[in-house]
């Protein structure tokens, strides 16, 4: 039996700059029941606070609701482990909510097969930013990627689309069914998960009244 090992805060994420969660790895428990607490202070303040919500984001986590989240302040966060034999603390982690945003995937992915005047066909991929993202006001600047592949293929073909929420893909195989997904990344944050797959079959012979 021994004091607990050093815990480690291994991830903090915000879906929208308005709330965030931090998760920790507990470290060894020293063979004894061990209690964990997350404490934090804010840039320029002496006061130390305890995690407002240990439940919402699951085990070994702390959820900061809107009431506790500010993008104007750096959070200095520590996890403390305590058992009968002693205690240990993680290294303090400095968290700027601007830099931990991982948004929800884009929505409304639509696929349309189109034809140019020269009879060349292409796939027109369109989508919308994630629901919570206030892109219009510049609160978020979002970049996007799409990926697609024939249904049976292993490898995805990835296209970076910048800030565009539509993209035209040329030179696809007639008669093939393609799977398409999209994802987004805010200017300083992390890529979202890939969206749910949409699929489209490229026609063998294409005639369109445009």
């Amino acid at each position: 039996q021994s004091p607990p090992g050093k815990p480690e805060i291994h991830k903090c994420r915000s879906p929208d700059k308005e709330t965030f969660t931090c998760w920790w790895n507990p470290g060894t428990d020293g063979g004894l029941p061990t209690n964990y607490s997350l404490t934090y202070s804010k840039e320029g303040e002496k006061t130390t606070y305890e995690c407002p919500d240990y439940k919402t984001s699951g085990p070994n986590s702390c959820f900061f609701s809107k009431q506790y989240t500010s993008i104007w302040k750096i959070y200095i966060i520590t996890v403390n482990a305590t058992n009968q034999m002693g205690s240990s603390s993680s290294d303090p982690l400095y968290v700027d909510v601007t830099y931990i945003v991982e948004p929800e995937p884009p929505r409304n992915l639509t696929l349309e097969v189109k034809q140019l005047k020269d009879k060349k066909t292409y796939l027109w991929v369109k989508w919308s930013p994630p629901t919570i993202t206030d892109v219009k006001t510049g609160w978020f600047t979002m970049e996007y990627e799409i990926r697609l592949k024939p249904e049976e293929a292993e490898e995805w073909e990835i296209h970076f689309t910048g800030h565009q929420t539509q993209f035209k893909v040329f030179d696809l195989y007639p008669g093939q069914k393609y799977l398409v997904q999209t994802r987004c990344k805010p200017d300083h944050g992390y890529w979202s998960r890939w969206s749910q797959e949409s699929s489209v079959e490229m026609p063998n012979d294409f005639t369109l009244k445009d």
């Epitope: 480690e8 291994h10 991830k11 903090c12 790895n25 840039e43 320029g44 993008i71 104007w72 750096i74 290294d91 982690l93 400095y94 968290v95 700027d96 601007t98 830099y99 931990i100 510049g138 990344k185 300083h188 992390y190 890529w191």
Partner: antibody, heavy 118, light 112 residues
């Protein structure tokens, strides 16, 4: 505790390439972005670029695009920077540096001195 | 790119004196989120740089309170109230509001 280990020095020929390593320990490697910084002898610091080890997303200083390539090996918790077409201008100390979830450098490697010489 | 200009280049001081280093940026350093990402690092001889001050005026963990930062917009200052021998080295200001992140040329604090 967090450590970033870099080899002390590399001597390389002009026109060749070199791949510098930065072995991370004491934290979850894929959780934090890794930056690279250049320091020429007796001069200031230049930010080269950053890589997110969780998905290998990179962002480069325009000045170093084509010169530096950042990669990671998550199985060994090691970040790499390859420098190509080396000239005497590339002779410098190169640091890897980790931020927290912030945009400054909290932890630094000891730096690798690259000397480009015929 | 944002150019960071530090003055003086060299600052000879006596131990116990106050030291002041200036840093001027070629663009305002207020980020779109309202924060000002101006930081100060100290590089001691033969070592890698260490963070002293983040976001203009916040001392990093373990940094003595004789170090203080101030400023706004494009003009920033680092002050050391009573210089100690362990403070000697090269001080760099750095901005991370605009990509690419850039550094000042450094100010060498040395004993008079």
């Amino acid at each position: 505790q967090v450590q970033l280990q870099q080899p002390g020095a590399e001597l390389v020929r002009p026109g060749t390439s070199v791949k510098l390593s930065c072995k991370a320990s004491g934290y979850t490697f894929t959780s934090f972005w890794m930056h690279w910084v250049k320091q020429r002898p007796g001069q200031g610091l230049e930010w080269i670029g950053v890589i997110d080890p969780s998905d290998t997303y990179t962002n480069y200083n325009q000045k170093f695009k084509g010169k530096a390539t950042l990669t990671v090996d998550t199985s060994s918790s090691t970040a790499y920077m390859q420098l190509s077409s080396l000239t005497s201008e590339d002779s410098a100390v190169y640091y890897c540096a980790r931020g927290d979830y912030s945009n400054w450098f909290t932890y630094w490697g000891q730096g690798t001195l690259v000397t480009v010489s015929a | 790119d944002v150019v960071m200009t530090q003055t003086p280049l060299s600052l000879p001081v006596s131990l116990g004196d106050q030291a002041s280093i200036s840093c001027r940026s070629s663009q305002r350093l207020v980020h779109s989120n309202g924060n000002t990402y101006l930081h100060w690092y100290l590089q001691k001889p033969g070592q890698s740089p260490k963070l002293l001050i983040y976001k203009v005026s916040n001392r990093f963990s373990g940094v003595p309170d004789r170090f203080s930062g101030s400023g706004s917009g494009t003009d920033f200052t680092l002050k050391i109230s009573r210089v100690e021998a362990e403070d000697l080295g090269v001080y760099f200001c750095s901005q991370s509001t605009h990509v690419p992140w850039t550094f000042g040329g450094g100010t060498k604090l040395e004993i008079k």
